[in-house]
């Protein structure tokens, strides 16, 4: 039975060149996890965490997405095709999976700065 | 290698508790889910329940719920089954098992103790 | 709770023979599914993970399939230490074990 529920960053947005945090939180459930899954919107994968292994970060990624904190991941060096869709996939026992998507827009340096003057604190 | 070592067989008296250990050596303890499971003499397996060895949270079954307690010691890598007031239909061997896998396609129990027997009679 | 049916309980076979053990799910479990071996005395051995994957270790001669609700056990010419009885177990939800079934010799 499936309890719990995911929290995410939800959408975001960042200036090209700049770096974001994508976080995932899982609540509400006695389930263990024993791995988390990071995708982008290509389905290829980022990164994974696992309970006894630790991280592994993808080769393609390697330069420009560090581990953490926790269980998130830090994007870094963003480029305008970083844009879209990114998912984390909880492993659970014993519920089963939990998915969570995040979308990331980014701006260009200026737009972003723009943007930023006018959100709200 | 891998293991989970039980303790020893144990003959107790209707009412009695008893305490089962099962400690776990050769990987890290809290990564992996604990499950005990239970099998009277000529029966099937029946699972009771699990312990979330990150968090210390138990789970139980059907049926297993007041008389029955997990626990842990991740200090010493050690997972505890305690029964109290002890019944005849209670006899039994007692298994602690390992949740293997990493993602949810791959869990199975993939390391069990050597179980430990418990006999409750008068 | 998912109930599992094990069938047969009981199979007599003789050295050499294909075995096959067939384990029905109450609901779609996909593959999550497991299967072990337990001899009289020992704990139980896992053989085969996610309704098809061999364990580790585990002879080529048991092969696993299936999906949903309906799988099988399989072991392509049997051996003497094979006589044992064997459980299926879903874990697609809180865990159930099969029956089991016991495979004597003939």
């Known amino acids: 039975m499936m309890t719990g529920t995911i929290e995410t960053t939800g959408n975001i947005s960042a200036k090209k060149g700049g770096s974001v945090i994508l976080q995932c939180h899982l609540s509400s459930t006695m389930a263990q996890v024993t791995q988390v899954n990071w995708e982008q919107h290509d389905h290829s994968l980022l990164a994974i965490r696992n309970a006894e292994l630790g991280w592994h970060i993808y080769p393609a990624f390697k330069d420009r997405v560090a581990p953490g904190p926790g269980l998130g991941l830090t994007l870094q060096s963003l480029t305008m095709n970083d844009t879209g869709e990114y998912f984390c996939t909880y492993h659970t026992y014993p519920d089963g999976t939990y998915r969570g998507r995040i979308f990331l827009e980014v701006l260009e340096s200026s737009v972003a700065e723009h943007s930023a003057r006018f959100q709200i604190p | 290698e891998v293991q989970l070592v039980q303790s020893g067989s144990e003959l107790k008296k209707p009412g009695a508790s008893v305490k089962v250990s099962c400690k776990a050596s050769g990987y890290t303890f809290t990564a992996y889910p604990m499950n005990w499971v239970r099998q009277a003499p000529g029966q099937g397996l029946e699972w009771m329940g699990w312990?979330?060895?990150?968090?210390?949270?138990?789970t139980y079954a059907q049926g297993f719920t007041g008389r029955f307690v997990f626990s842990l010691d991740t200090s010493v890598s050690t997972a505890y089954l305690q029964i109290s007031s002890l019944k005849a239909e209670d006899t039994a061997v007692y298994y602690c098992a390992r949740v293997g896998g990493y993602s949810v396609y791959d869990y199975a129990f993939d390391i069990w103790g050597q179980g430990t027997m418990v006999t409750v009679s008068s | 709770d998912i109930q599992l049916t094990q069938s047969p309980s009981f199979l007599s076979a003789s050295v050499g023979d294909r075995v096959t053990i067939t384990c029905r799910a109450s609901q779609g479990i996909s593959s999550y599914l497991a299967w072990y071996q337990q001899k009289p005395g020992k704990a139980p051995k896992l053989l085969i993970y996610?309704?098809?994957t061999l364990q580790s270790g585990v002879p080529s001669r048991f092969s696993g399939s299936g999906s949903g609700t309906e799988f099988t056990l399989t072991i392509s010419s049997l051996q003497p230490e094979d006589f044992a009885t064997y459980y299926c177990?879903?874990?697609?939800?809180?865990?159930?074990f099969g029956g089991g079934t016991k495979v004597e010799i003939k």
């Open positions: 996610a309704a098809s």
């Open positions: 312990i979330n060895t990150n968090t210390g949270n138990p």
């Open positions: 177990q879903q874990l697609n939800s809180y865990p159930t």
